[in-house]
């Protein structure tokens, strides 16, 4: 059903990293425009991206209101220049997205090793606590603020001169690892939410090696 030459959106896909959340869909419009609605299970639909020719809509502002809720979005198609027109049943064509629960599904962004400090045979490695777009009391929360102990970091480290990797884990943003004195090490970090069934791990942070500018060394 639907107005002639108006087609329903398809391939609705959530793209979300650290709660920055965009809905994408197809097709590129020809003589039509789109409006997006989003709702939790309450059915209180909120319209966004009115009469757009884009095939994406930033829904971050809506999902950060409660990242533990499950959201559904729907994309309505209207004839360009005649947005009051509806389908043959008196309803505009629309398609639903998959369900999306940000807390369970947003991708974990690539972490950054903020600093490392060697004291004797110990190295303290700190992973940057990235800011998200989730707010509380007018302040942006960090990834750790949002996920708490659900979020761990894994550190992979190795002697610069070899390839055999060791691992360490922390449920804070800091590692304290044992190293050999006078030996240079390289490392990268990965964010992990072990309780998840999808999107459990981030991509790896950039590799950092001792002797580079982020490091500090004390005997």
């Amino acid at each position: 059903s639907g107005t002639t030459n108006t087609v329903a959106a398809y391939n609705l896909t959530w793209k979300s990293t650290n709660f920055k959340t965009i809905l994408e869909w197809e097709p590129k419009p020809v003589n039509q425009v789109y409006t997006v609605q989003i709702s939790t299970k309450s059915g209180d639909w909120k319209s966004k991206c009115f009469y757009t020719t884009d095939t994406e809509c930033d829904l971050t502002d809506e999902i950060v209101k409660d990242v533990k809720q499950t959201y559904l979005a729907r994309v309505f198609s209207y004839p360009a220049g005649n947005v009051e027109s509806t389908g043959s049943a008196g309803e505009p064509l629309y398609e639903n997205s998959p369900e999306f629960t940000p807390y369970l599904e947003t991708n974990l962004g690539q972490p950054t090793i903020q600093s490392f400090e060697q004291v004797g045979t110990k190295v303290n490695v700190t992973v940057e606590d990235e800011r998200t777009l989730v707010r509380r009391n007018n302040t942006f929360l960090s990834l750790r603020d949002v996920f708490g102990k659900d979020l761990i970091y894994t550190l992979y480290y190795w002697k610069s001169s070899s390839s055999g990797k060791k691992t360490a884990k922390t449920n804070t943003n800091e590692f304290l690892i044992d190293v050999e004195k006078g030996v240079s090490y390289c490392f990268f970090a990965q964010a992990v939410i072990p309780s998840r069934t999808v999107n459990r791990k981030s991509t790896d942070s950039p590799v950092e090696c001792m002797g580079q500018e982020k490091g500090e060394f004390r005997e």
Epitope: S1, S39, K41, S42, G43, D44, W45, L72, N96
Partner: antibody
Amino acid sequence: EVQLLESGGGLVQPGGSLRLSCAASGFTFSNYAMSWVRQAPGKGLEWVSSISGSGDYTYYTDSVKGRFTISRDNSKNTLYLQMNSLRAEDTAVYYCARSPWGYYLDSWGQGTLVTVSS
Amino acid sequence: DIQMTQSPPSLSASAGDRVTITCRASQGISSRLAWYQQKPEKAPKSLIYAASSLQSGVPSRFSGSGSGTDFTLTISSLQPEDFATYYCQQYNSYPYTFGQGTKLEIK
């Protein structure tokens, strides 16, 4: 466990009124749209009305528009259906149901019988 | 209003049988369709939503398929507790409408 318990049904004369209630428990009531569905004796299911979690959006089947009013009190976890100007054809078991996104009906009450007869 | 037509209206089968019930919408509803099971004197129970998504707690012998106007509910191996009446429902647009039901009886 989700529980929905309807009450308020009974025998009423044509032209009369009844208010049905549905007490909800086991979930965050305000987070869900809710619906009323009815079933006349020996017949199939008929969707009657739906309301969004905030109560801001309400929807009705044509045959009850202007006669029935759906409402909710989120502080009491209760859904209502005010039925006025009742007709014989409104005789049915009325079910309250939870309705994610105001779409399908994932949990149902046990129903309450409304009989409209003189 | 969108009309929902189920077939067959009634069906006799035996435990262990594979059973298919169909539902046809009078116009395209994408995959906005649900299936319910109702036993005598009981409230309906949700089985399937979004045409093919299994409701939590429903046995995997139940499955749904279809999109647009034609949909099916399949029970892969009938169990004694599956004898009941089955309804489809569209939630594409208001007023939401149900099929007239398919009564599944023991042969």
